[in-house]
Each structure stands twice: as C-alpha cells, then as structure tokens.
C-alpha cells in the first residue's frame, strides 16, 4: 500500500481556487525526491502538470505552483481560476509518476449557481441554524408572511405565519415577526439537512401587491481534516461544534459502508469494543468543545471518522458535525513492542516503552487506563521520582535501555493489575503506546521470603531462588526507591534446592545487609536482566526492629514471616493468594496518598540515608 | 515545605511583553521539571509550557508557541517565562507549578486541576488590553 495520503475528493466552484496537500513519510530520501502532480489519462499514464524541480505544464502557467514542506512531510498544490475542465483523475506523488508512490485525487469543478438577481446566498454547514431574513412594507405588515422553497417548477410552502409548517422542517423551523418598529420577519432553519438547500422565496402578502425576497441556501457538507499517523502511534481528534450544543451528547463515529457511521465512543457510555483500553474521550468544555485520543493505531483504523452531537449519542440526519479522514501510515517509525504482557499472581512484569529518541530529555510517564465514563488515564509513575502511593515498593519506571526505549517494572502481581497501560511521555504526543496486562494461572519463577525483620546492628541474610531457566541470565539484588532500584552486593550461594526438576543450573542468590539501620528498612527486590534488559523481579519487605537477642539472621523461606493471606506450605515455600505483599504496617488502601516532597539540600530517596519515615508515603 | 512565588505580572498593551520569574524553594529545584499553566476570566487551567529539569528539553502549547520562552537557572532557583507579542487572550493569571500527577499528557484542554500538580504557586495576573 502507498504510505502517500491526500484527499480523495476535491470540489470546487469555476473561477475559483483549491489547495490541495498531500502526505508522505518524512524520511530523508522522501523529503528530497521529486513530487509532482499529474493528471491521468484514459489509457492509462500520467502526464505531469508540476513538479517540485521546476516544471509547470502550459495549462497551469500563471495559475499553480507545488511548495514542499520536508519537515512536515507534506506538499501543497495550489490550483487557481478553475474552469470545467479541470474536472478529472489527478495523482499526487514522489519520484517518478509511474512508480505507484502516488494517491489518488478526484477534482470536481461543477458550474456556479444562475441566481437570480437580488438573491441573497446563505451558506451554512450541515447541522447548523440559518436565519433568512425578509424584508416588507409598510403596507404587507398585517398581511401573510410566507416562505417557499422551489422544487423543479414549483414553489412548495414550507412556513407561514397561519402556523403551517412543512413536514419536512417540523420541530426544526420557526417563523419570526420583528417588533412593531422593524418591517422585517425571518425564518430560522435548525439541524441544516443536506437536503435544505436550494432555492427560497419569502413573501410578504398574497397579492400584486405582495413583498417578494429570493434566497440561496448553500448547505455544506465538513470538508474531512487529513489526519496522517503513524501505525501503533496515536491520533487526536478536536472536536468544537459550538455552545448551541454544549448540553448535547456528543459522539464520535467511523464511517463504514454506505452513510453508516459506527459509534467509537459517546458521552453516554458507549464505547466500540475494538477501541477498549486505547481511547479517551476528554471532557468537553463551556463551549462544547471535546476531544478524543486513540493510541496504539491499527491498519483498519484509518478511515474516515465524524464527530457530532445528537441527543441520542449517535449520527442522525441534522447533526452538527466536524470530519476527518485518517491515514494510517504502515511505514511507522514506531518501533513494535509487545501489546500483550503476561504475568502470573505474585509475579512481575517488565514493560518495554518505546519514546521518540529525539526526545530523551522528556519526562516519561505510566499510566492506568481506566473505562468508567469517557475513559482517563491517572499516571501511576514518572521518569522525575514520583510513584503513586498505593504502588510504593513495586513498581518502577527505569530510562533503561535508553535510546527510544524505557522500561517500566510491576511486581506483587494481583488480579486487579490486570488491564491496559498507556506509556507516554510529555514530549511528541503521537508516541503514545498501549499495552495489555494479562494476569495467568501459574507461580512466580523468583522465589523469596516473605517479610523479613531484621534486627538493629545485626547481618541479615536474605535467600534469592532463581530457576535454571535464568542460568544465562544476570541476577541482582536492589533496594527500591522513588528513582529506581539502587543495585546491591549479592552472593552466589550455588545451586538452589528449591526447585523440582531443575539442575544444578538453578540459583540461590543471597543479599546480606550487614550492621542493619533503620534506614534499611524498605522494599528490596531481587532479578534478572541481561544487558540493559529486565526480566522478572520478586519483592521482599525488610522491617528492622530493636535487638532482642544477639547475633546474625540467615532467613529462609520457611522461616520468614508469611504476609498476609499466605499459607506456608511444607515445601518451605509461599502461596500467594492474588494479594499484593507489603508491609502489613503499610497497606495501600488504608495509607493517606500524600504527595511529600524532598528537603532541597537533601536527595529524593536515599538508599544510603535517610529513616523509613522519608521513604514512606507517595515521596519524592 | 515547597514554596513557589511568582512575579512580574501586570498591564501591558498588544503587542507589548513582559517576563514572569517564580522563585521556588524547600526541594531540589534542579532535579525536577517545571510548569507554567494560566487561568483566563472566567475559563479552566491551561497549560501553558514546560521545561525539563536541566533546561535542554522545553515544549509549548499551540496557542503559545513562537511567542512565549521558558527558561530556568537553576543556581537561584528560579524559573521564567517571557511573553512577547501579547495579546488580549493572554490575559490570565498566570502558576508555576511542578510535579504533574494528571491523567495522562499533554493536559488534556478543559480539564486540567489544581490537583494534577504536587505544588503550586499563588499565581501574578497578566492583563493584555489597550
């Protein structure tokens, strides 16, 4: 498929001027080659009207030119006193005109309106109001006020000042006398149809005598907005259909076969399942003003998309609307990353974000899509320090890999993480990606105790059980804070006794905090990564406590205290029952979600410093 | 505590400029992104513009862009915007704000709240009218 877009359609008047844009992927030989525009022949070919490199057929001399603006990736073709037989099949494109990197335009010039004189023309977009205005003597004042629309020959009534009203126009028309002092009625038309335009006469009176105005009402269809986005990029469309419709339901809607239009999402909850976990409908304002974001773009997305407003929440004849025609451009310089991450309860995932790697200094964030009303999407971690409160101790965002990618590690997993995230950043917007968590049946593959107290002054031994699955990978130890994860000394302890079926491949990796202080206390993590890559993570909370007895703490599974709703199981080893571990001092729902912030001599969470008060609440 | 004070608001003709400092203390200024977001009569928050924490990544809302500069120095902890080329839809009372915590980004229009920010200043009025 041609990754060129531009209008499918263009309509015109004679005499007057088009512009026409077209679209291609900015990529450097793209900006640089030849574009042209050419008009297609019956037999086929393409004969040049202009180009880029100078060119200018006789028939557009004086009347055209082709601007190229490369750091956009698009070019202008601007057509000027249109004629008839500008009418035709056009292509615009790159290179050389049969090479098939080119899009299709139709150009329609149709002929102006023979108007009668003294007509006054009305032009008014489809789903808005239009008010005629008729002007009258003195001596038609008390008499009947009329409107007419001619229909082939004949003038049919559509109004008058008796109370009759055409059933085309009922509920939707309504006929105005000026006060006493103004010799004027008017005749306001509302929810415009396609199918209002045409030819009005008003009148004022019934004999020789009678007032008479012609009207010309022009009803015009939304020219659709291109919109040309990169695949598994993200679209924003901005909807302002005015303040007459603030208190409407608004929707937005893709046109499938037909004048079907599909609703994607609407103010009254509705939502089409192909769009769930990758659309928000944004609040609208004052105005009626709305907007609509869809991230992770698929091929069959692209097409032509109506935003409106109707009561019903979808498209009806005299909606107010505001068009746009998507392209979906498959030579995206979105790089693929999985859409799908699974995880089993207790375990973790690791979450690969791609970013625009011009914009490595942006601030990059994580968040939660949430479907209940419009859809939003609250952030739950940033790149600056700041991890929501409820999600202290598990997750993490790391500017790892780097280079267009970073990564973003969950740990703790229960059912309720399951659903979709958004990675993004507060640099180019389009670069919105989503991702799906799904939680499955299974057991964690790390295997750690569950809370561990450590006593004041003492050395704490904290046992990492890793799979011979990971035997090529790196196994570390860290301590969690707001920034990251602070990696620590561990001890290869050799093979690991944990595991059925596994050889001496598997691990037993140990952390030892020696002379334990308070400012120990906190949520350590072991894993595995190879590279700059992160695979899978388990979190053990350590509390530190007042010495009661003397000497070290060589923890093991079966020794550790179990979290809550855990059972110890014979083996040695935890079965987490879909909740999160956590300090049981510290349980999400019932901590206060304070947004604490770091003294300015001292730094955002320590590993070395500071008590487990500073690394407590939603600190950064 | 974190504490931002912003100035240099006031009455300025079409066309006119004017720059606006906020002045932040009680956290590690230089190691956090910055905000400016406004409030026109009568309208909802706006953002406004952004700057990273070493001053080498900026982006701008449309209606701002080519008109207004954010910068920062970071050794008085100070951030700035200067305006230029006022005009009367500027009027606003103009926050520096830092620790963005909305939902989602850029801010969506319309619904941006006091509480999508950690901190927040107490604002200075800018007034663009002849």
């Known amino acids: 498929k041609s990754p060129i877009f531009g209008p499918e359609e263009v309509n015109s008047v004679e005499g007057n001027s088009v512009s026409i844009t077209c679209y291609y992927p900015p990529t450097s030989v793209n900006r640089h080659t030849r574009k042209y525009w050419c008009r297609q022949g019956a037999r086929g070919g393409c004969i040049t009207l202009i180009s880029s490199e100078g060119y200018v057929s006789s028939k557009y001399a004086g009347r055209a030119n082709l601007t190229n603006f490369p750091e956009n990736g698009t070019f202008v073709v601007n057509i000027a006193q249109l004629s008839q037989d500008d009418s035709g099949r056009y292509k615009c494109g790159l290179g050389i005109n049969s090479r098939g990197l080119s899009f299709d335009v139709s150009l329609e010039v149709s002929q102006g309106p023979g108007l009668l004189n003294d007509t006054k023309v009305y032009t008014v977009d489809l789903g808005r109001t239009v008010t005629i205005n008729c002007p009258f003597k003195t001596e038609n004042a008390q008499k009947r006020k009329s409107l007419y629309k001619q229909i082939g020959l004949y003038p049919v009534l559509v109004i008058d000042s008796s109370g009759y009203v055409n059933p085309n126009y009922t509920g939707r028309i309504r006929l105005d006398i000026q006060g006493t002092g103004q010799l004027l009625f008017s005749v306001v038309i509302n929810q415009l149809r396609l199918s209002d335009a045409g030819q009005y006469l008003c009148q004022a009176g019934d004999d020789s005598n009678s007032n008479k105005k012609n009207a010309d009402l022009q009803v015009l269809k939304p020219e659709p907005e291109l919109v040309y986005e990169d695949l598994r990029g993200s679209v924003t469309f901005h909807c302002a259909l005015g303040p007459e419709v603030a208190n409407v339901a608004k929707f937005l809607c893709r046109q499938s076969s037909g004048e079907n239009c599909d609703v994607v999402v609407n103010t009254l909850g509705k939502r089409a399942p192909a769009f769930e976990g990758r659309i928000l409908l944004n609040p609208q304002d004052k105005d009626g003003s709305f907007s609509v974001v869809i991230t992770g773009l698929r091929k069959e997305d692209a097409g032509r998309y109506l935003c409106g407003a109707h009561s019903d929440g979808q498209l009806q004849e005299g909606s107010p609307i505001q068009a746009w025609q998507l392209f979906v451009n498959e030579e995206s310089t979105i790089p693929r990353s999985p859409t799908v991450v699974k995880g089993v309860a207790g375990g973790s995932v690791a979450v690969l974000c791609p970013y625009n790697r011009k914009e490595s200094k942006s601030i990059k964030y994580w968040c939660l899509w949430e479907g209940a009303q419009n859809g939003r999407c609250p952030l739950l971690v940033d790149s600056e320090g700041w991890v929501k409160a409820q999600y202290e101790g598990r997750l993490s965002l790391l500017e790892e890999p780097g280079n267009g990618t970073f990564t973003v590690i969950l740990n703790q997993l229960t059912s309720r993480d399951a659903g979709f995230y958004w990675c993004l950043t507060n640099g180019d917007t389009l670069w919105r990606t989503t991702v799906e968590i799904k939680i499955i049946e299974g057991e964690p593959n790390l295997k750690v105790p569950g809370n561990v107290t450590a006593v004041l002054g003492e050395t704490l031994k904290v046992p990492c059980h890793f799979p011979c699955k990971f035997s090529s990978y790196e196994k570390y130890w860290c301590k969690w804070n707001n920034t990251g994860c602070q990696a620590l000394p561990s001890q290869d302890e050799g093979p690991s006794k944990a595991f059925v079926n596994c050889d001496e491949n598997s691990r037993l990796v140990s952390l030892t905090l020696n002379l334990v202080t308070r400012a120990d206390e906190g949520w350590y993590w072991c894993g595995v990564k190879q590279g700059h890559f992160y695979g899978e993570t388990a979190a053990v909370y350590v509390a530190v406590e007042e010495r009661k007895a003397a000497g070290s703490r060589d923890v093991s599974l079966a020794k550790a205290d179990a979290a809550p709703d855990e059972k110890v199981l014979d083996s040695g080893f935890r079965e987490i029952e879909n909740k999160a571990i956590q300090d049981p001092r510290l349980f999400a729902e019932e901590k206060a979600v304070a947004d604490t912030r770091d003294q300015a001599d001292g730094s955002r969470a320590s590993v070395d410093s500071g008590s487990s008060e500073e690394q407590g609440g939603s600190s950064r | 505590e974190v504490q931002l004070v912003e100035s240099g608001g006031g009455l300025v003709q079409p066309g006119g400029s004017l720059r606006l400092s906020c002045a932040a203390s009680?956290?590690?200024?230089?190691?956090?992104?910055m905000y400016w977001v406004r409030q026109a009569p009568g309208k909802g928050l706006e953002w406004v513009s952004t700057?990273?924490?070493?001053?080498?990544?900026?982006i701008y809302a449309d209606s701002v862009k080519g008109r207004f500069t954010i910068s920062r120095d970071n050794a008085k902890n100070t951030l700035y915007l200067q305006m230029n080329s006022l005009k009367p839809e500027d009027t606003a009372v103009y926050y520096c704000?830092?620790?963005?915590?909305?939902?989602?980004?850029?801010?969506?229009?319309?619904?941006?709240?006091?509480?999508?920010?950690?901190?927040w200043g107490q604002g200075t009025q800018v007034t663009v009218s002849s």
């Open positions: 009680g956290f590690a200024f230089s190691r956090y992104g």
């Open positions: 700057i990273n924490s070493g001053g080498d990544y900026i």
């Open positions: 704000a830092e620790g963005y915590r909305g939902s989602e980004w850029p801010p969506p229009a319309f619904t941006l709240q006091r509480a999508d920010f950690a901190s």
